[in-house]
């Protein structure tokens, strides 16, 4: 806590610029108007205080805000947002994307802190859904951000929101989280025609059920081992060998150097050792 | 890790010019503000320039201002200092360090390169 002291003869400061730098702790304590420092909050980012000097203009406008900051400022803070703690963040209402953006680009390129979690949190729950303009800008900033819901949290996304997911943003999701999206998925793309339809539920397919996949195989899809790796081993396992031969097309050799693991190796196991052979892999069920 | 590498300093006389270069990770780069400080023999290390992450606003020490000029390349991930009017007061090392913030104070930089001598003879 910065001590009370009178602002020495002079420098009281009419507006926020960059001689502030040059201001003590304790003389931007006395010398900033709190009321000035918010209706100039756009001026602080393009100043480069330090630090400490940041605490100092936190401390001002925590005091002019007990209740929690308004949008207008929140969406200027800049590198205070640094400073901000998930207590903070808690008594905002966030509700501009283009708030959340600035804010989160101020943690660009870093982990997601607290303070980031936090303020996602309020921005999703104040929306009441993770609509695709937002999905879209929280991906972009981490694409981790999906997987990092419970299929719970998941379950509100609305499945026009899909349409902003990238492969690279499921890298991460498990078993549980894909089972909730892949019906989602299946319904946003539902009216593609085949090959187009097969691209975009692709790195969904984790979560998709045996008669999805039958009815893939239908249609030359030509599916990789690494996504047929990681599909669900319980939809897999009812599939027959000439089902797993088309649902793979020319990729069906690559069956051989996965035969000891999940799901292939369970999926063999499962087989006639006729049909098996009738692949020409050498494979042994 | 984070790596920052110095290059262009030198020997120069008196009124001549040098540009420094400070290659940087791309994530170094794109989630930090860049900053060059100074540290002459028996002296405090001394702020210099810094340009920020957003926005792309520029601040120069006084005793630079108008001689000195900071940039930076997006695509090298590098940023530079353009220093002409150079004069024997200018000698040091040479740093360039980033911050998560846009700071003044070489407290709030995290990273620092190895340094570059710059020498400049009257």
């Known amino acids: 806590e910065v001590e009370k002291t009178a602002c020495p003869s002079g420098k009281k400061a009419p507006e926020i610029d960059e001689s502030l730098i040059f201001y003590k702790k304790w003389e931007l304590e006395a010398c900033v108007d709190a009321a000035l420092l918010a209706t100039q909050m756009d001026r602080v980012n393009a100043i480069p205080f330090t630090y400490e000097q940041l605490d100092v203009l936190k401390h001002k406008l925590d005091e002019l805000y007990p209740q929690g900051y308004p949008e207008s400022v929140i969406q200027h803070l800049g590198y205070l947002f640094l400073k901000m703690s998930p207590e903070d963040i808690r008594k905002w209402n966030v509700t501009s994307l283009e708030t959340l953006k600035a804010l989160l680009e101020v943690n660009k390129g870093h982990e997601m802190s607290p303070q980031v979690a936090t303020l996602i949190d309020r921005f999703v729950k104040g929306r009441g859904q993770l609509d695709k303009d937002t999905l879209d800008t929280l991906t972009a900033f981490y694409p981790g951000y999906l997987c990092s819901l419970s299929p719970e949290e998941l379950s509100s996304v609305p499945p026009s929101s899909i349409w902003a997911v990238r492969p690279q943003d499921l890298d991460t999701c498990d078993p549980r989280q894909l089972d909730v999206l892949y019906p989602k998925a299946r319904l946003a793309f539902q009216n593609m025609n085949g090959s187009e339809y097969f691209v975009k539920i692709q790195s969904f397919l984790g979560g998709a059920p045996t008669e999805d996949l039958k009815a893939l195989s239908q249609q030359n899809v030509s599916m990789d081992l690494a996504t047929f790796m990681k599909l669900r081993t319980d939809a897999v396992l009812p599939l027959t060998v000439a089902e797993v031969q088309k649902l793979l097309g020319p990729h069906v050799e690559g069956l051989k150097a996965e035969e000891r693991h999940r799901p292939v190796r369970d999926w063999i196991l499962r087989q006639r050792q006729d049909d098996l052979d009738t692949l020409g892999l050498g494979l042994q069920g | 890790e984070v790596q920052l590498v110095e290059s262009g300093g030198g020997l120069v006389q008196a009124g001549g010019a040098l540009r420094l270069s400070c290659a940087a990770s791309?994530?170094?780069?794109?989630?930090?503000?860049m900053g060059w400080f100074r540290q002459a023999p028996g002296k405090e290390r001394e702020f210099v320039a810094a340009?920020?992450?957003?926005?792309?606003?520029?601040y120069y020490a006084d005793s630079v201002k108008g001689r000195f000029t900071i940039s930076k390349d997006n695509a090298k991930n590098t940023v530079y200092l353009q220093m002409s009017s150079l004069k024997p007061e200018d000698t040091a090392v040479y740093y360039c360090?980033?911050?998560?913030?846009?700071?003044?104070?070489?407290?709030?930089?995290?990273?620092w390169g190895q340094g570059t001598q710059v020498t400049v003879s009257s």
């Open positions: 340009i920020n992450r957003i926005g792309g606003h520029i």
């Open positions: 360090a980033s911050s998560r913030i846009y700071s003044h104070s070489a407290r709030d930089y995290d990273y």
């Open positions: 791309e994530r170094t780069f794109s989630s930090s503000s």
